[in-house]
């Protein structure tokens, strides 16, 4: 599949219209700036609750705040999936659920949120300071992961407020999809601003060619794009302060009893809002990862509807192992 963004060639201003054109070049940057700032960065929220009835029984709820379609959700504990975490459940929006002890029941709550009940007894039972992570693979945004745990002083029956996840992970599909167009717009904006700085009334030259967005190849990213997008995996434990009730979701995220609407009615929060995002609760993680699509498995892809691309660099089997399989 190829995604090409055709940008119309800019025509030179007609004589006598330089004043109006100056106005236009001032308006365009602001339009682009607004686009850049409000361009949705998806978010993942995580909520961990200890059941009052069974002190060692937990309920984890996770949700995805983005406009893309979710292709897979992985819930892990002990850290992010693939970084020391062990998979508790994998949920596919069409194909169902795979879960592992101490998971008792994983289920979809809405099209963009899931819940997982953990067993309260046995050797593999969670303890109060266990970190639980939720990773949402979506198209076109890529994979987004957030982690959370119960605050140390939690009373049974209380839940930690939803942990916001201003996560900076974007996969190839996201980068070369919607983001590609926005990136082009932002670069173009900077270019315009720079030119505007040097020349108060710039005379735009006719564009001979139509620039194209990079061509996205889901299965085999080019070496160039791999090099350009390579960011080492990092997990930052933001144990800055204990979770308090002011660690609310930036969108006034769902309370424990409130169900998310089937479709998020708001646009995801943009990069500009990161600065105002509350620090995640104690024991929460923010993961920074650039994963590129890799061919999943050695076998030729099966044909037929419902085929899902797994935007995890380690392929779909990574979902089932502690450090990822293969």
């Amino acid at each position: 599949m190829r995604t090409e963004a055709q940008v119309p060639a800019l025509q030179p201003p007609e004589p006598g219209l330089e004043g109006a054109m100056g106005h236009r070049t001032l308006v365009l940057p602001w339009v682009l700036l607004t686009l850049c700032v409000t361009a949705g960065t998806p978010e993942v929220w995580v909520q961990v609750r200890m059941e009052a009835t069974e002190l060692s029984s937990f309920t984890i709820r996770c949700g995805f705040l983005g406009s893309g379609s979710i292709s897979l959700v992985t819930v892990s504990w002990g850290g992010p999936n693939g970084a020391g975490g062990t998979t508790l459940a994998v949920l596919h929006p069409e194909r169902g659920i795979r879960q592992w002890a101490p998971a008792r029941q994983a289920r979809w709550e809405t099209q963009s949120s899931i819940s997982l009940i953990l067993e309260g007894s046995g050797a593999s039972s969670p303890c109060a300071n266990t970190t639980f992570c939720c990773k949402f693979a979506s198209f076109p945004e890529g994979s987004w992961e957030a982690c959370g745990s119960l605050p140390p002083s939690s009373d049974p029956g209380l839940s930690a407020p939803p942990t916001p996840a201003p996560i900076l992970r974007a996969d190839l599909a996201g980068i070369l999809g919607v983001s590609g167009v926005l990136l082009f717009g932002c670069v173009y904006l900077l270019h315009l601003l720079r030119r505007h700085k040097h020349r108060p009334a710039p005379r735009l030259q006719p564009s001979r060619t139509s620039p194209q967005a990079p061509r996205a190849r889901a299965w085999a990213p080019s070496q160039a794009s791999q090099a350009a997008l390579h960011v080492p995996y990092a997990t930052i434990n933001t144990s800055c302060r204990p979770a308090t009730l002011d660690t609310a979701h930036p969108h006034g995220g769902p309370s424990w009893w409130a169900s998310l609407p089937t479709h998020a009615a708001h646009r995801p929060q943009g990069p500009a809002a990161w600065a105002s995002t509350p620090i995640p609760a104690r024991g929460s993680f923010v993961s920074v990862e650039n994963g590129l699509y890799a061919q999943a498995g050695e076998r030729p892809p099966h044909t037929g509807p419902g085929l899902t691309l797994f935007p995890d660099p380690r392929g779909p089997r990574a979902m089932e192992g502690p450090l990822g399989v293969r």
Epitope: H92, E94, R95, G96, I97, Q105, R107, R317, P322, R326
Partner: antibody, heavy 119, light 107 residues
Amino acid sequence: EVQLQQSGPELVKPGSSMKISCKASGYTFTDYSMDWVKQSHGKSLEWIGAINPNNGGTSYNQKFKDKATLTVDRSSSTAYMELRSLTSEDSAVYYCARWDSDYWYFDVWATGTTVTVSS
Amino acid sequence: DIVMTQSQKFMSTSVGDRVSITCKASQNVRTAVDWYQQKPGQSPKALIYSASNRHTGVPDRFTGSGSGTDFTLTISNVQSEDLADYFCLQHWNYPYTFGGGTKLEIK
């Protein structure tokens, strides 16, 4: 060729325990989880549970939680199912089946182990 | 638990005919349904996964359809070797559950 080879038929006494083995070959054992299925004589199939050979993580049908224990031996690429406190109700054919986590289904089944519980 | 109901326990057909085996889920299971064939004295074998995708090597006379609660396995141009039990399976929720099976008999 991908193969799952199960241990032979068993005749066991009520109240006893037994262990069925399922040896995998022709693929990387830790890449696929292994599920177990029961088929009582002339009846349908019942899913017992699954094990992830990578880390030994298990998942059980609550109905079989006190009946079956799933384990793996990675060194020999073998999955095991132990059945305890056997009764005549446990007389059945037990299958191990490989779960394809790319496409979400049981793509390879073993030949099955017939267990007869009788005094 | 999700109940998978295969209402026809037995179905009789002739070689060359077209037959449809149905499976109904007690709740919405999206497309998390597979079909397995079990010939007499053998272990089950995968036919269809995710409601409509054929397993490798399965003849194209086998087709799966449906989503939500109603699923169908259709065998067109039935062959004598298709004599078998056919089971549906849901893996939308735990525990995974199979249908009661439909035995296909060849006249």
